[in-house]
Interface confidence: low
C-alpha cells in the first residue's frame, strides 16, 4: 500500500495509473467503500462522500492512463485509505494529512519563544525537523519549541514532517520584531553633528508604539532619559526631550536622532527601547558615542577620546609626512614639544581608522 503525506489546507494528488493509455472506467472510494468520484463517458461523476465537493480529477491526464484523484483544502480527517478501481484492479493509497501551526502570533519579539504544534491523524507517529532561515536545525515530535528567538530567526522556517519514510514540507513565515543591530557605535570629533539611526529588522503595515532613549554618559554617575517619543502608523512624534543635549528626531522611519554637537560630556552609551502596541515586551538597541578631542596647550600636544572604547583600540599622534608617531592602547596620548606641522590624531582598530582629527602646530620662535 502506497503512503502519501498531505498538508492541511493544501492540495494532494493520489495517483492511479492504467496500463492502457486511454480513457477507461475508474472509481475512487474511501475505506468504507463510499464512492468519491469516477468516470461516466467523458464526465466526472461524484459520489455521496464528504469529500465530493473537494475532490477532482484532471481530465487532461486521462488520455495518458492517469486517473488521479486530487483532494483540495485537505483536512486532518481526510486521512484514510483510498481505493482506486481501474481495469479490474484495485490500488490502495493511504493518505496522512498533517498540519503545522504556530501556537501564538507569528510576529514575536526578540527573546520570546516560538512553539510550533503538529496536528496529525490518530495512530500516526510523525517526527518533525525545522530549519530556521539562519540555518538552525530543531527536531521534535508533536511540538517544536524555540525558547529564545533571535533576529536571524526572522523569515521562512522550513519544517519537514516525516512518517513511514515519507516527508511533507511546511513553510511558516516568522517575523522577529527587533532592530537590525543589537549595538552600534558612532565615532565623532568634538563639535561635529552626531547622527544615530535605529533601523528595524522588519516591516509592518501599521506600526504603533512608544519609545525612549536612556543615556549613560561616561562622566555622569547615573543615566538619564534624553528623549521620549510616540510612533503612530510609522509617524514619529517627540513627547519630551532634555534641554541638554537638545536632540532632534526624524518624523519618519527609520528612527533617527540628531545630536547637534559631539562633546566629551555626552560620550557614553545609550539604550533605545521601543514598545509596540499589542505586544508584550520591548525592542532594544544599544548605541555608543565616542568623542575625540585634539588640543595644544603650551608645549603639550594632547589627543583624548571619551566614551566606550575597547582596550584593543589604538590612539596615535602622528606628524603628517613624517615618521614621528606616538601610539598607545589608551584613552589619551600626548607629545611634549611637538614639531611644527599638521598632526593627526587617529583612533584605530587593527589598522582600520575609526576616527581622525587634525591639529596644526605652529612653530614657536
Amino acid at each position: 500500500k502506497k503512503v502519501v503525506l498531505g498538508k492541511k489546507g493544501d492540495t494532494v494528488e493520489l495517483t492511479c495509473n492504467a496500463s492502457q493509455k486511454k480513457n477507461t472506467q475508474f472509481h475512487w472510494k474511501n475505506s468504507n467503500q463510499i464512492k468519491i468520484l469516477g468516470i461516466q463517458g467523458l464526465f466526472l461523476t461524484k459520489g455521496p462522500s464528504k469529500l465530493s465537493d473537494r475532490a477532482d480529477s484532471r481530465k487532461s491526464l486521462w488520455d495518458q492512463g492517469c486517473f488521479s484523484m486530487i483532494i483540495k483544502n485537505l483536512k486532518i480527517e481526510d486521512s484514510d485509505t483510498y481505493i482506486c478501481e481501474v481495469e479490474n484492479k484495485k490500488e490502495e493509497v493511504e493518505l496522512l494529512v498533517f498540519g503545522l501551526t504556530a501556537n501564538s502570533d507569528t510576529h514575536l519579539l526578540e527573546g520570546q519563544s516560538l512553539t510550533l504544534t503538529l496536528e496529525s491523524p490518530p495512530g500516526s507517529s510523525p517526527s518533525v525537523k525545522c530549519r530556521s532561515p539562519g540555518g538552525k536545525n530543531i527536531q521534535g515530535g508533536r511540538t517544536i519549541s524555540v525558547p529564545q528567538l533571535e533576529r536571524q530567526d526572522s523569515g521562512t522556517w522550513t519544517c519537514t514532517v516525516s512518517q513511514d519514510q515519507k516527508t511533507v514540507e511546511f513553510k511558516i513565515d516568522i517575523v522577529v520584531l527587533a532592530f537590525q543591530k543589537a549595538s552600534s557605535t558612532v565615532y565623532k570629533k568634538e563639535g561635529e553633528q552626531v547622527e544615530f539611526s535605529f533601523p528595524l529588522a522588519f516591516t509592518l503595515e501599521k506600526l504603533t508604539g512608544s519609545g525612549e532613549l536612556w543615556w549613560q554618559a561616561e562622566r555622569a554617575s547615573s543615566s538619564k532619559s534624553w528623549i521620549t517619543f510616540d510612533l503612530k502608523n510609522k509617524e514619529v512624534s517627540v513627547k519630551r526631550v532634555t534641554q541638554d543635549p537638545k536632540l532632534q528626531m526624524g518624523k519618519k522611519l527609520p528612527l533617527h536622532l540628531t545630536l547637534p554637537q559631539a562633546l566629551p560630556q555626552y560620550a557614553g552609551s545609550g539604550n533605545l527601547t521601543l514598545a509596540l502596541e499589542a505586544k508584550t515586551g520591548k525592542l532594544h538597541q544599544e548605541v555608543n558615542l565616542v568623542v575625540m578631542r585634539a588640543t595644544q596647550f603650551q608645549e603639550n600636544l594632547t589627543c583624548e577620546v571619551w566614551g566606550p572604547t575597547s582596550p584593543k583600540l589604538t590612539l596615535s599622534l602622528k606628524l603628517e609626512n613624517k615618521g614621528a608617531t606616538v601610539s598607545k592602547q589608551a584613552k589619551a596620548v600626548w607629545v611634549l614639544n611637538p614639531e611644527a606641522g599638521m598632526w593627526q590624531c587617529l583612533l584605530s582598530d587593527s589598522g582600520q581608522v575609526l576616527l581622525e582629527s587634525n591639529i596644526k602646530v605652529v612653530p614657536t620662535w
Partner: antibody, heavy 116, light 107 residues
C-alpha cells in the same frame, strides 16, 4: 506525482522581454518556493530566482534588476519575465521546485534564443 | 555568493569503473549539498540530497559524502546509463549556486 509543464516564446530579438510560464499539476502548490533555473548552451546551471504562494520572492543579485517572477495561485501557475534581453540570455530555462532544499521535480525546459 | 568548484571538469572511464567527483564550497555549507545528473537534452535529476541521502528511486551505486566545504559523489560501478554530466548544488544561502559540472565520458 507533481508535474511541471512550461511554455513561452522561444525566439527573441535583443532588447525584447523574455516571458515564460510554468503550470504545476497534481502536487502541493502552497508552502513551496517555485523556482526558475537557466542553462546556457554547453554551460552550467544558474539559479534565477523563486517565489512562494504568497508572492514573496528571492532573486539572484546578478539578474535582479531585469527579472520579475510572479504567481497566479488560482491557476497554479508561476511566470518569469526578463527584460532587455541580450545574446547572453540565450539558454534552456527550467521551472522547478525545491522540495525542502533540493530541486525535484523539474519542468521539461524551454530553449530561449536571443538573436537579431 | 558561495562558489562551488567541481573537479575534474571531465573524466573518462569504463563500465564497471569506480568514479569519484569532488565539489568544494568557498565557505562552510554544512551538509546543505545536492548532486544532480543531467543527460543531453534533459532536465537535471536529483541523485543525492543533504550531502549523503539517496533520493528515492536512485540506484545504490551512487553515494555522497562530505561536510563543511569538501564533498564527494561516488559511482561504485559505472553503468552505461551513468555517462552524463554531474552537478553539485549548495542550498546553504542565497543565491543558490551550482558547480561547473563534471562530464563522465566513455573511455
Amino acid at each position: 506525482q507533481v508535474l511541471l509543464e512550461q511554455w513561452g516564446a522561444g525566439l527573441l530579438k535583443p532588447s525584447e522581454t523574455l516571458s515564460l510560464t510554468c503550470a504545476v499539476y497534481g502536487g502541493s502548490f502552497s508552502g513551496y518556493y517555485w523556482t526558475w533555473i537557466r542553462q546556457p548552451p554547453g554551460k552550467g546551471l544558474e539559479w534565477i530566482g523563486e517565489i512562494n504562494h504568497r508572492g514573496s520572492t528571492n532573486y539572484n543579485p546578478s539578474l535582479k534588476s531585469r527579472v520579475t517572477i510572479s504567481i497566479d495561485t488560482s491557476k497554479n501557475q508561476f511566470s518569469l519575465k526578463v527584460k532587455s534581453v541580450t545574446a547572453a540570455d540565450t539558454a534552456m530555462y527550467y521551472c522547478t521546485r525545491p522540495d525542502s532544499n533540493w530541486f525535484d521535480p523539474w519542468g521539461q525546459g524551454t530553449l530561449v534564443t536571443v538573436s537579431s | 555568493d558561495i562558489q562551488m568548484t567541481q573537479s575534474p571538469s571531465s573524466v573518462s572511464a569504463s563500465v564497471g569503473d569506480r568514479v569519484t567527483i569532488t565539489c568544494r564550497a568557498s565557505q562552510d555549507i554544512s551538509n546543505w549539498l545536492a548532486w544532480y545528473q543531467q543527460k543531453p537534452g534533459k532536465a537535471p535529476k536529483l541523485l543525492i540530497f543533504a550531502a549523503s541521502s539517496l533520493q528515492s528511486g536512485v540506484p545504490s551505486r551512487f553515494s555522497g559524502s562530505g561536510s563543511g566545504t569538501d564533498f564527494t559523489l561516488t559511482i561504485s560501478s559505472l553503468q552505461p546509463e551513468d555517462f552524463a554530466t554531474y552537478y553539485c548544488q549548495q542550498a546553504n544561502s542565497f543565491p543558490l549556486t551550482f558547480g561547473g559540472g563534471t562530464k563522465v565520458e566513455i573511455k
